[in-house]
């Protein structure tokens, strides 16, 4: 909360470069989306062109687990990724230009927490600095959304239906259709992060088949129609 912070005004001309890191207090994003964690820094080593390493941690500075690490060779502006947890973290900034900003893909609620950036100069100017005051990532839950619904050919001239939905918490999927009882058990597919897929393996009757996705934030529906062409008698 900003209420406890003390506002400041410039009291003098711009200072010489010292070690510092600038991160926002908070970044908000919705589950399933991507977020950018900004981090810029200043340092006292003018024109440093040696090897460097950029690191992001979660949870705690200094001791928290690394979620991203990349290394740039002397003179190179390319920071070669050495670690990207679950392949979802990517450096957006250019460390040579004092920018360690990170992009996090396919956010889940579990990604909420504090993240800390760190830079290490490993050449002649052997030095390092890490933000003690991390950026807090708040991932908010997402209501269900059906991203794909389709009818596909199945075995023995039958048809099957697939429904893929996303949301956080992951939604529960249910199929309903024209079969007796007006409802069919769906085979719940493997969830992929915030996405869930359910299959209705055998569509036995023509008509409308509806996929319903529901979680604590709401529900979504989508339908497909199956009309098989029956030849003349």
């Amino acid at each position: 909360d900003a209420s406890g912070d003390l506002l400041n005004t410039e009291a003098h001309s711009a200072p010489a470069q010292r070690w510092s890191m600038q991160v926002p207090a908070e970044v908000n994003a919705e589950a399933g989306d991507a977020a950018v964690l900004p981090c810029t820094f200043t340092h006292p080593h003018r024109h440093y062109d040696g090897p460097l390493t950029a690191i992001w941690r979660s949870g705690e500075p200094y001791a928290g687990p690394q979620v991203f690490r990349c290394t740039a060779a002397p003179g190179s502006e390319l920071c070669q990724t050495a670690l990207s947890l679950h392949g979802r973290f990517r450096l957006l900034g250019n460390p040579r230009r004092n920018d360690l900003s990170l992009r996090v893909e396919r956010l889940a609620l579990a990604d909420s927490g504090r993240y800390f950036c760190r830079v290490e100069f490993t050449g002649d100017a052997h030095d390092r600095y890490e933000s003690r005051h991390g950026v807090r990532l708040r991932v908010t839950a997402a209501a269900p959304r059906i991203v794909n619904i389709s009818v596909l050919p199945g075995p023995a001239h039958a048809f099957r239906a697939l429904c893929t939905a996303e949301g956080e918490p992951p939604p529960a999927l249910a199929w309903s259709g024209p079969a007796p009882g007006n409802s069919s058990a769906a085979l719940q597919g493997q969830g992929h992060g915030y996405q869930v897929t359910a299959e209705l393996p055998a569509l036995t009757r023509d008509g409308r088949y509806t996929c319903t996705a529901a979680n604590s934030l709401g529900r979504a529906e989508a339908s497909v129609y199956l009309f098989r062409f029956h030849g003349a008698p």
């Epitope: 406890g4 510092s20 006292p44 949870g59 928290g64």
Partner: antibody
Framework: QVQLVESGGGLVQPGGSLRLSCAAS????????MTWVRQAPGKGLEWVSF????????YYADSVKGRFTISRDNSKNTLYLQMNSLRAEDTAVYYC???????????WGQGTLVTVSS | DIELTQPPSVSVAPGQTARISCSGD??????ASWYQQKPGQAPVLVIY???KRPSGIPERFSGSNSGNTATLTISGTQAEDEADYYC?????????FGGGTKLTVLG
């Protein structure tokens, strides 16, 4: 308003223990690193210890390492300093302070006096 | 360990400019902050990041940092500015304070 209030100081014999508390109000306590700073009578300020938001990361001045333990209870908005094996040279006013985002101390308590004497 | 050195005392006439220095190798790489402490009171932050002033601190307080020396400048010093002043810095892990400077406003 933003406020820090220390308590728990007093007279203790050498080798004894004491626990200081610092009650925070007016800001989101769990969003800040906190610190203890002490000042011996007629002397300057001496940084004692830092603790991170959740309490997982702590740092100590060499003069107190192994004897003092900093901790916090975010549910109670309270910072603690457990002081063991106290020595005469630990006699001081102990201040708790909030660390701002530029590694400076932007809010201070009024202090609590700890006297170590036989 | 990082060390910061301050003069024990500085005197200034009312209305004049007071300058208090703080030197140490850490100041080449890390920002300085300054604290004012009056007798029987807790310290108060007056400058941070070498030259930034918290809200509520008068404009006559300013700061600078060049090389390994940070300087607190009080322009148009007033009687109420008489106090002890401490510089502080941080090396990425620990914090350290200078020994303090007693500012006396003459007259």
């Amino acid at each position: 308003q933003v406020q820090l209030v220390e308590s728990g100081g007093g007279l203790v014999q050498p080798g004894g223990s004491l626990r200081l508390s610092c009650a925070a109000s007016g800001f989101t306590f769990s969003n800040y690193w906190m610190t203890w700073v002490r000042q011996a009578p007629g002397k300057g300020l001496e940084w004692v210890s830092f603790i991170s938001y959740s309490g997982s990361t702590t740092y100590y001045a060499d003069s107190v390492k192994g004897r003092f333990t900093i901790s916090r209870d975010n549910s109670k908005n309270t910072l603690y300093l457990q002081m063991n094996s106290l020595r005469a040279e630990d006699t001081a006013v102990y201040y708790c302070a909030r660390e701002g985002t530029s590694s400076m101390f932007d809010v201070w308590g009024q202090g609590t006096l700890v006297t170590v004497s036989s | 360990d990082i060390e910061l050195t301050q003069p024990p005392s500085v005197s200034v006439a009312p209305g004049q400019t007071a300058r208090i220095s703080c030197s140490g190798d850490a100041l080449r790489s890390y920002y300085a902050s300054w604290y004012q402490q009056k007798p029987g009171q807790a310290p108060v932050l007056v400058i941070y990041d070498d030259n930034k002033r918290p809200s509520g601190i008068p404009e006559r307080f300013s700061g600078s940092n060049s090389g390994n020396t940070a300087t607190l400048t009080i322009s148009g010093t007033q009687a109420e500015d008489e106090a002890d002043y401490y510089c502080g810095s941080y090396d990425g892990t620990v914090h350290v304070f200078g020994g303090g400077t007693k500012l006396t406003v003459l007259g």
